[in-house]
Interface confidence: medium
């Protein structure tokens, strides 16, 4: 089938005191090969500081996955989610507050 770019959504949730968990979700993409990783100051974090979900079919002939990491509250601006899919890439910031969800459909 043709390439379908992912919808990327970054959320944040409270973790332990002074920390938050930031999660980057990519959904509705095809084919299934994708790079999704957290970056600090532009460089990728190591695998052992991130948690990945499996790349799973979402029932519409496309796929979804996620990556999460824990960061210090107040340092959100240093972190971005980097996505690469079918030769295209995009970078997504951490939203500034709990109620904010950033959606970005990459074209």
């Amino acid at each position: 089938g043709s390439t379908v770019p992912p919808m990327v959504n970054v959320t944040r949730s409270e973790a332990s005191e002074g920390n938050i968990t930031v999660t980057c979700r990519a959904s509705s993409f095809y084919p299934r090969n994708i790079i999704l990783t957290w970056r600090q100051d532009g460089v990728s974090l190591s695998h052992d500081t991130q948690q990945w979900g499996d790349v799973l079919p979402d029932g519409n002939g496309t796929y979804q996955t996620w990556v999460a990491t824990r960061i210090c509250r107040g340092e959100e601006q240093r972190f971005t989610c980097y996505m690469e899919h079918s030769g295209n890439h995009s970078t997504h910031p951490v939203p500034s507050g709990n109620s904010h969800h950033h959606h970005h459909h990459h074209h």
Epitope: G42, L45, H89
Partner: antibody, heavy 122, light 112 residues
């Protein structure tokens, strides 16, 4: 590699502000992190802050948080640094520099502008 | 902040000599991702600095192979195997592992 062309020398009075520019060409501006650095005559370098052109996100050296403000104009592929409440201690050459990242492989200041001399004098 | 200390302050050399520059950090500069972001820059009089070495030992594009970087933890070295006239200037080490990123005070390589 591309080019990074900085604005010309500035002579400013104490207490004033100055806005320096760094116009880029030859690379995809929005994919890049741009840092600003300070060098006083005959001294070493200090990192001031970076800005990610793709989102406008910034990270500052705490020493400069009240002094510097970084912005970008993606339409003209230009990065700016506004320096406020200037004192003679701010007299220096200010450089912009582009990071060169790929994954965990990083070169922080791979490509530099030519520098802008700021002189603060009454 | 991580303090970067360079020695010597000045290094007089003869052209063709080997030069060895030292850089010591006040704490371990391994990044959270496991890499050590230690870089070396050369600044010639009246010019902007130029990147020579990144990630301790990797030569940046266009940098001659007479430049080599080594070290780990807190102790790092830049070696120039045969100094040429174009190598004269001030060398700075830099750490990009911990914010705020910091430079050493510099080593001036000059003709003996």
């Amino acid at each position: 590699q591309g080019q990074m062309q900085q604005s010309g020398a500035e002579l400013v009075k104490p207490g004033a502000s100055v806005k320096l520019s760094c116009k880029t060409s030859g690379f995809t501006f929005s994919d890049n992190y741009i840092s600003w650095l300070k060098q006083k005559p005959g001294q070493s370098l200090e990192w001031i802050a970076w800005i990610y052109a793709g989102t406008g996100g910034t990270s500052y050296n705490q020493k400069f948080t009240a002094k510097a403000q970084l912005t970008v104009d993606t339409s003209s592929s230009t990065a700016y640094m506004q320096f406020s409440s200037l004192t003679t201690e701010d007299s220096a050459i200010y450089y912009c520099a582009r990071h060169d990242y790929y994954g965990t492989s990083g070169a922080w200041f791979a490509y530099w502008g030519q520098g802008t001399l700021v002189t603060v004098s009454a | 902040d991580v303090l970067m200390t360079q020695t010597p302050l000045s290094l007089p050399v003869s052209l063709g000599d080997q030069a060895s520059l030292s850089c010591r950090s006040s704490q371990n500069i391994v990044h959270i991702n496991g890499n050590t972001y230690l870089e070396w820059y050369l600044q010639k009089p009246g010019q902007s600095p130029k990147l020579l070495i990144y990630k301790v030992s990797n030569r940046f594009s266009g940098v001659p192979d007479r430049f080599s970087g080594s070290g780990s933890g807190t102790d790092f070295t830049l070696k120039i195997s045969r100094v040429e006239a174009e190598d004269l200037g001030v060398y700075y080490c830099f750490q990009g592992s911990h914010v705020p990123w910091t430079f050493g005070g510099g080593t001036k390589v000059e003709i003996k």
